[in-house]
Amino acid sequence: DGCKDIFMKNEILSASQPFAFNCTFPPITSGEVSVTWYKNSSKIPVSKIIQSRIHQDETWILFLPMEWGDSGVYQCVIKGRDSCHRIHVNLTVFEKHWCDTSIGGLPNLSDEYKQILHLGKDDSLTCHLHFPKSCVLGPIKWYKDCNEIKGERFTVLETRLLVSNVSAEDRGNYACQAILTHSGKQYEVLNGITVSITERAGYGGSVPKIIYPKNHSIEVQLGTTLIVDCNVTDTKDNTNLRCWRVNNTLVDDYYDESKRIREGVETHVSFREHNLYTVNITFLEVKMEDYGLPFMCHAGVSTAYIILQLPAPDFRAY
């Protein structure tokens, strides 16, 4: 059918709760493209009717909720004027019963998120919640071993649980819970997190190192397309978020209307002692207002910026 297969993504998911997957592959999805979702090589696209339990919401596929029988390979087809790309997403739905006494104890969370806290440090856990704008998420509650977390050492900040002065007792089974509202209906999202404790600072200390950019300026012509990578090395067990910000706002939020500047999908390469992460920023069309503005790459507590600069006039052209 002339479509180029980009990659296959595997996702293992909890049943009986919402799930969403966004079909983005910068710079392909940055331009004028149409995105269509299909299930198991079906010729019939996933419904776009918002009342459907499984439906496409802009570039997302949304399950409200995910359940038994939804496992399978879903394809996202990205069509441009002269191109066609396809992303395969292999979804496996797992039955999950947090604290349901009829099962007898907690589930095996090996397939869920695994996060690490560093002993004696102030650290944090992250609740990964990725949903389209049509989904409104309520405040996040945190649980440890089925009990809601309370106490002075714990602070909930947006999607994170801040833990001060981490102790060995902080290891265990955590869950973050939020109520998601979509089209007037409410759903519970519950993510299990297996938390272990480490003493070692790991590769280059526990602070991520931004290899590139290096707080410098980049000469770029007005109106051109520009992609800049942020390369970060961090410990294999890190829980740091990596992102691009402008004016202290995520670029995807700052340019939410125009989508002219977007953050790319993070990739990483595993080395024996550390991981090398790459997350890019794409300027579809550089505008005058972009010059002189620091675009910040954040990785945990580390930051580095680029500033766009107009090239010096080339007098040889005259």
């Epitope: 359940e67 038994w68 039955e95 009829s102």
Partner: antibody, heavy 122, light 107 residues
Framework: EVQLLESGGGLVQPGGSLRLSCAAS????????MSWVRQAPGKGLEWVSA????????YYADSVKGRFTISRDNSKNTLYLQMNSLRAEDTAVYYC???????????????WGQGTLVTVSS | DIQMTQSPSSLSASVGDRVTITCRAS??????LNWYQQKPGKAPKLLIY???SLQSGVPSRFSGSGSGTDFTLTISSLQPEDFATYYC?????????FGGGTKVEIK
């Protein structure tokens, strides 16, 4: 304690209809897939139908497709089997069962009700 | 649809005997095979799921093996309460199907 209690069985004429119910207790019903299995007198087990947690996915044996409808009401903790155009060969004890799939693929019925007898005869 | 063939359809054995029941699928079902026990007038009871995982509360004398198309249920030392009918079931794809059953009787 997990309990499944079927009801609604009885004697019905060929071509008639019947609705079976299965009342569930002792577990969070809305988080489990459910199924119906039947057993004709003196015969083996035959899988009839299954339904996902919120009812979004339903499955049927070829022998009942188009005639039987599985459904559930999570607010009432109840599973249903609407049986239309009944035939003599549908005569059986009908069991409801809780379906598990902790490994993602493959599933099994870990709790069963005691069954309700459906007799189709003129 | 996947057909499940069980053998033997019946067998006679004594207490303490080692009993083996086989189940064959018409196509590969990976490890998506379960075994159930049923006594007269009672509902079936889950013994083994996923070929070899013992359901909670089931005695360790029951074991399962196999993969693909050929599977075995073994009772290492038959006990009086084990005289019943045993069914295999595939859960690889719907419609899920049962084997015809194996009746284990007292010799």
């Amino acid at each position: 304690e997990v309990q499944l209690l079927e009801s609604g069985g009885g004697l019905v004429q060929p071509g008639g209809s019947l609705r079976l119910s299965c009342a569930a207790s002792g577990f969070i019903f809305s988080r489990y897939a459910m199924s119906w299995v039947r057993q004709a007198p003196g015969k083996g087990l035959e899988w009839v139908s299954a339904i996902s947690e919120s009812g979004g996915n339903t499955y049927y044996a070829d022998s009942v497709k188009g005639r039987f409808t599985i459904s559930r009401d999570n607010s009432k903790n109840t599973l249903y089997l609407q049986m239309n155009s009944l035939r003599a060969e549908d005569t059986a004890v009908y069991y409801c069962a809780r379906q598990r799939y902790p490994g993602g693929s493959g599933s099994y019925a870990d709790y069963w009700g005691q069954g309700t007898l459906v007799t189709v005869s003129s | 649809d996947i057909q499940m063939t069980q053998s033997p359809s019946s067998l006679s054995a004594s207490v303490g005997d080692r009993v083996t029941i086989t189940c064959r699928a018409s196509q590969s079902i990976s490890t998506d095979l379960n075994w159930y026990q049923q006594k007269p007038g009672k509902a079936p009871k889950l013994l083994i799921y996923g070929v070899s995982s013992l359901q909670s509360g089931v005695p360790s004398r029951f074991s399962g093996s196999g993969s693909g198309t050929d599977f075995t249920l073994t009772i290492s030392s038959l006990q009086p309460e084990d005289f019943a009918t045993y069914y295999c079931q595939q859960s690889h794809s719907t419609p899920f199907t049962f084997g015809g059953g194996t009746k284990v009787e007292i010799k």
